[in-house]
């Protein structure tokens, strides 16, 4: 009696069950009375990442140039290609399609976590005793002076944009 | 029902290339492949190579060089290149429907001789 | 690619004996799947090979029940039980579990 259904890596085909072709590999013939599943191996730039019935193999990801991508891992006839930014970009997308320039932080805020290839800048706002001046990408909250410790005082607050300004202690003459 | 016709020219000279053609009826070419096979004069079979649904190709490695299987799937028809054949090329040449092994051609008697 | 070897050269029987031929193949002929790919044919003078058994042991529709294939592995063998006049002919084993496909050198099966 044909199989209504086939053993893992086999596919139900004309009543019978078929090999499927290994990783790497694609379809070119189903198996018949007299032979098996015919497969040949994916060609220079192609891949097939799993056991398969594909009549063709899946194109290699291109790592544009232009869309600021660049090859972080080759493809083989199993895997995919992987592609990441150029640095000072990142991705705009998990499947890393095209990039853009990391973001900066604002002054008044200060980077939490730096850019990498796919996730951008993470900024946070200086909090109270922390500032940042100037727009960076790297430039995290610096702390404000401590005057004290110069054997100076205080002689204009600090903001979240400002350090503190330090003056000498008036003396008492 | 399946039927296979192998022509081409019976004399071929020594370091031409043998052109045959095989006309195919009761399957579809472009679902199933077809396999060249020859057997010289009083000696046993060799399998030369097989053109598969999609195009693909497969050649005996110790004919590799020579050998070329193309095919025109809208005249049913596959065609087989054997290039600088000698006389060791002589032999009868047929086809094979793939999953059709009870099917063969009648074959062709190709001589390569000056 | 793997080799395949008949034996005997010639086997010289009279009609009604028992004829057994053997393949050796050069390495398994079991597939990963579980399956063997090893056909018989016959073949006589000016015509084309007839399929006589494929997988090892199937008979091919409309091939008498004299006719048998057994054997695993390296080893097979195809025995006609009772010679008819018509199986004298040759006979040759074929491997299609991998590329390239293969045939044996054949048997020719005489009248003793």
């Known amino acids: 009696e044909p199989p209504t259904a086939c053993r893992e890596k086999q596919y139900l085909i004309n009543s019978q069950c078929c090999s499927l072709c290994q990783p790497g590999q694609k379809l070119v013939s189903d198996c018949t009375e007299f032979t098996e599943t015919e497969c040949l191996p994916c060609g220079e730039s192609e891949f097939l990442d799993t056991w398969n019935r594909e009549t063709h193999c899946h194109q290699h990801k291109y790592c544009d140039p232009n869309l600021g991508l660049r090859v972080q891992q080759k493809g083989t006839s199993e895997t995919d290609t992987i592609c990441t930014c150029e640095e000072g970009w990142h991705c705009t997308s998990e499947a890393c399609e095209s990039c853009v320039l990391h973001r900066s932080c604002s002054p008044g805020f200060g980077v939490k976590q730096i850019a990498t290839g796919v996730s951008d800048t993470i900024c946070e706002p200086c909090p109270v005793g922390f500032f940042s001046n100037v727009s960076s990408a790297f430039e995290k909250c610096h702390p404000w002076t401590s005057c004290e410790t110069k054997d100076l005082v205080v002689q204009q607050a600090g903001t979240n944009k400002t350090d503190v300004v330090c003056g000498p202690q008036d003396r008492l003459r | 029902q399946v039927q296979l016709q192998e022509s081409g020219p019976g004399l071929v000279k020594p370091s031409e290339t043998l052109s045959l053609t095989c006309t195919v009826s009761g399957f579809s070419l472009p679902t199933s492949g077809v396999h060249w096979i020859r057997q010289p004069p009083g000696k046993g079979l060799e399998w030369i190579g097989v053109?598969?649904?999609?195009?693909?190709?497969n050649y005996n490695p110790s004919l590799k060089s020579r050998v070329t299987i193309s095919k025109d799937n809208s005249k049913n028809q596959v065609f087989l290149k054997l290039s600088s054949v000698t006389a060791a090329d002589t032999a009868v040449y047929y086809c094979?429907?793939?999953?059709?092994?009870?099917?063969w051609g009648q074959g062709t008697l190709v001589t390569v001789s000056s | 690619e793997i080799v395949l070897t008949q034996s005997p050269g010639t086997l010289s029987l009279s009609p009604g004996e028992r004829a057994t031929l053997s393949c050796r193949s050069s390495q398994s002929l079991v597939h990963s799947s579980g399956n063997t790919y090893l056909q018989w044919y016959q073949q006589k003078p000016g015509q084309a090979p007839r399929l006589l058994i494929y997988?090892?042991?199937n008979r091919f529709s409309g091939i008498p029940d004299r006719f048998s294939g057994s054997g695993s592995g390296t080893d097979f063998t195809l025995t006609i039980s009772r010679l008819e006049p018509e199986d004298f002919a040759v006979y040759y084993c074929?491997?299609?579990?991998?590329?390239?496909?293969?045939f044996g050198q054949g048997t020719k099966v005489e009248i003793k």
């Open positions: 094979l429907g793939h999953g059709h092994f009870d099917v």
């Open positions: 997988k090892v042991s």
């Open positions: 053109i598969w649904a999609g195009g693909d190709t």
């Open positions: 074929s491997q299609t579990t991998h590329v390239p496909w293969t």
